[in-house]
């Protein structure tokens, strides 16, 4: 029986470890600045890194600019978006800016898109200063189903800071759905 | 066999509880305002509380102004930094401020420092208002190895809000590395 | 013995699943805009949704405008608060605003209230622009005991953005207390 108990313990350790890892999808995606759209209107950002520098993904999928959920669960979602302008980049079309981020969820089964989180600020970036910067952070806890897709929309994408420490979003699974 | 099963169950409960607690390091460090450097340039903040008020730490180490990782894993890192100025504090050398935070990771093995997250804003804190305030929040999910160190750099440290609810950073382990 | 082992495994799976779910309370509460107080002073926000749209709660209680902890543990708490003003809403009493959020913890046993996190900004919302917007995000890791209550205070509540993606707060349990 002792050998049996050791076997039970051993198989349990394996099962616990394996199930724990399988049960915790995550992603941290950083902006791919080689393909940022221009303009000042709200656009969906489709170019993100998932496997270089701080960017990583596990048990989730990145496809067509969207983060796809592979496993039902409750996830903590977050985004950090930085905007900047230096006078050497040229004159702004307007000094009154609306710098915004929208974290959206799309369901393929029911083709609809809904905003989970939004943040940002109106800013007056006057010519009196040669450099302007502003960052937004949002985060929240959401129920996500397999197949649902998370995407990021921003206003004024041409002002995005292209550094991996500046503009990124991510998710990690916290618990199963009952 | 029933007694044996109870023993298996009992030992498993202990093991599960013990391993769960051991597997979840965390820290929430609050600013120690008795030792904030002056100056407007970017500086590393080295004085933080780890064991008073909201500040706490478990299975991580705080040493020489840095939060040291003791256990490999994926962690959620966060920081909240508040800046404030009241006219009674004196005259600002410039009304045009760059209020920034940088969350950095240092590896001792390869002596190098990298910024994981940054946030902030340029601000115009004019003399027309007697009081100014601004807060930054950043957060993200990162792979950390034992021995790596997390530190906080800010610009204009003399403007930091010294309250424990205002200026703090932290981390908690979410999952093991596969 | 094989049948016995299967029974051990089976009961363990059930126990593991059950204890895991029981051990992870969470809440994501979104603003109920039908009952937002007026005024510019700091007020406690008592009207939140807990069961519609993105709002949800499990193993925690929402009562009298407060999020009540039912289970000791370490929790990650967060809040996202959006303020906005359009000129069609009328003139602001002052263009110099202090837009703030305070996440507070109240203990019933010791009737006292303490601020866990704060964030915000002073803003100059001039009449030169027809629309103004600003969002605050705060988050942190805190030890909470059963019976303790979390509430949200803001300044200028009449400027709150009533969307569920804009103004919300939440919590999820990360680990037990040792």
């Amino acid at each position: 029986i002792r050998a049996e108990k050791a076997m039970v313990d051993g198989s349990w350790l394996d099962l616990a470890k394996r199930s724990k890892l399988e049960a915790q999808p995550f992603a941290h995606l950083t902006i791919n600045a080689t393909d940022i759209p221009s303009g000042s209107h709200k656009v969906s950002l489709s170019s993100w890194y998932h496997d270089r520098g701080w960017a990583k993904i596990s048990n989730m999928t990145f496809s067509n600019g969207k983060l796809i959920v592979n496993q039902d669960g409750f996830y903590y979602l977050y985004a950090n978006i930085c905007f900047r302008h230096h006078e050497t980049s040229g004159d702004l079309a307007t000094e009154y800016l609306q710098l915004m981020v929208y974290v959206t969820k799309t369901s393929i089964k029911i083709p609809s898109s809904h905003t989970l989180m939004k943040g940002g600020s109106t800013k007056y970036w006057s010519g009196n200063s040669e450099f302007h910067f502003y960052s937004i952070n949002v985060g929240g806890f959401f129920k996500l189903r397999s197949g649902e897709e998370i995407s990021i929309e921003v206003s004024n994408p041409s002002l995005l800071d292209p550094d991996q420490d500046a503009t990124y979003f991510g998710a990690f699974k916290v618990r199963d759905i009952d | 066999i029933r007694a044996e099963k109870a023993m298996v169950d009992g030992s498993w409960l202990d093991l599960a509880k013990r391993s769960k607690l051991e597997a979840q390091p965390f820290a929430h460090l609050t600013i120690n305002a008795t030792d904030i450097p002056s100056g407007s340039h970017k500086v590393s903040l080295s004085s933080w509380y780890h064991d008073r008020g909201w500040a706490k730490i478990s299975n991580m180490t705080f040493s020489n102004g840095k939060l040291i990782v003791n256990q490999d894993g994926f962690y959620y890192l966060y920081a909240n930094i508040c800046f404030r100025h009241h006219e009674t504090s004196g005259d600002l050398a410039t009304e045009y401020l760059q209020l920034m935070v940088y969350v950095t990771k240092t590896s001792i093995k390869i002596p190098s420092s990298h910024t994981l997250m940054k946030g902030g804003s340029t601000k115009y804190w004019s003399g027309n208002s007697e009081f100014h305030f601004y807060s930054i929040n950043v957060g993200g999910f990162f792979k950390l190895r034992s021995g790596e160190e997390i530190s906080i750099e800010v610009s204009n440290p003399s403007l930091l809000d010294p309250d424990q609810d205002a200026t703090y950073f932290g981390a908690f382990k979410v999952r093991d590395i596969d | 013995i094989r049948a016995e082992k299967a029974m051990v495994d089976g009961s363990w799976l059930d126990l593991a699943k059950r204890s895991k779910l029981e051990a992870q309370p969470f809440a994501h509460l979104t603003i109920n805009a039908t009952d937002i107080p007026s005024g510019s002073h700091k007020v406690s926000l008592s009207s939140w949704y807990h069961d519609r749209g993105w709002a949800k709660i499990s193993n925690m209680t929402f009562s009298n405008g407060k999020l009540i902890v039912n289970q000791d543990g370490f929790y990650y708490l967060y809040a996202n608060i959006c303020f906005r003003h359009h000129e069609t809403s009328g003139d602001l009493a002052t263009e110099y605003l202090q837009l703030m959020v305070y996440v507070t913890k109240t203990s019933i046993k010791i009737p006292s209230s303490h601020t866990l996190m704060k964030g915000g900004s002073t803003k100059y919302w001039s009449g030169n622009s027809e629309f103004h917007f600003y969002s605050i995000n705060v988050g942190g890791f805190f030890k909470l005991r059963s019976g303790e209550e979390i509430s949200i205070e803001v300044s200028n509540p009449s400027l709150l953005d009533p969307d569920q993606d804009a103004t919300y707060f939440g919590a999820f349990k990360v680990r037990d207390i040792d």
Partner: nanobody, 127 residues
Framework: EVQLVESGGGLVQPGGSLRLSCAAS????????MGWFRQAPGKGREFVGF????????YYGESVKGRFTISRDNAQNPVYLQMNSLRPEDTAVYYC????????????????????WGQGTLVTVSS
């Protein structure tokens, strides 16, 4: 890397005028508070003047008060030092620096409170 470049120096007769400028390159600090200092041969660095980031406040060394004026463009770069009624004792190499403090302290006239010094520009007052 930040670099400050002073220019506008030269030879001028006593009673004459010169306008120096200080421009920043690299990661610029054009909206920082700035200071002008000078160093005559064989002497230490002497405080000339200070200007806040907005240009709203200026301070001057005793020896130049009423003769020298610091200004800055409303836009940004550079910071100017207008020198009038020049005297032979104004002969020196003139340097600008970026004030390193957030608040104006009583030590604004000390060169140790400044960073990112340039190479300087020589001003010679002689007949």
């Amino acid at each position: 890397e930040v670099q400050l470049v002073e220019s506008g120096g030269g030879l001028v007769q006593p009673g004459g005028s010169l306008r120096l400028s200080c421009a920043a390159s690299g990661r610029t600090f054009s909206r920082s508070a700035m200071g002008w200092f000078r160093q005559a041969p064989g002497k230490g660095r002497e405080f000339v003047g200070f200007i806040t980031g907005s240009g709203g406040t200026t301070y001057y060394g005793e020896s130049v008060k009423g003769r020298f004026t610091i200004s800055r463009d409303n836009a940004q770069n550079p910071v100017y030092l207008q020198m009038n009624s020049l005297r032979p004792e104004d002969t020196a190499v003139y340097y600008c620096g970026v004030y390193r403090r957030t608040y104006i302290s009583s030590t604004y006239s000390e060169s140790s409170e400044y960073d990112y010094w340039g190479q300087g520009t020589l001003v010679t007052v002689s007949s």
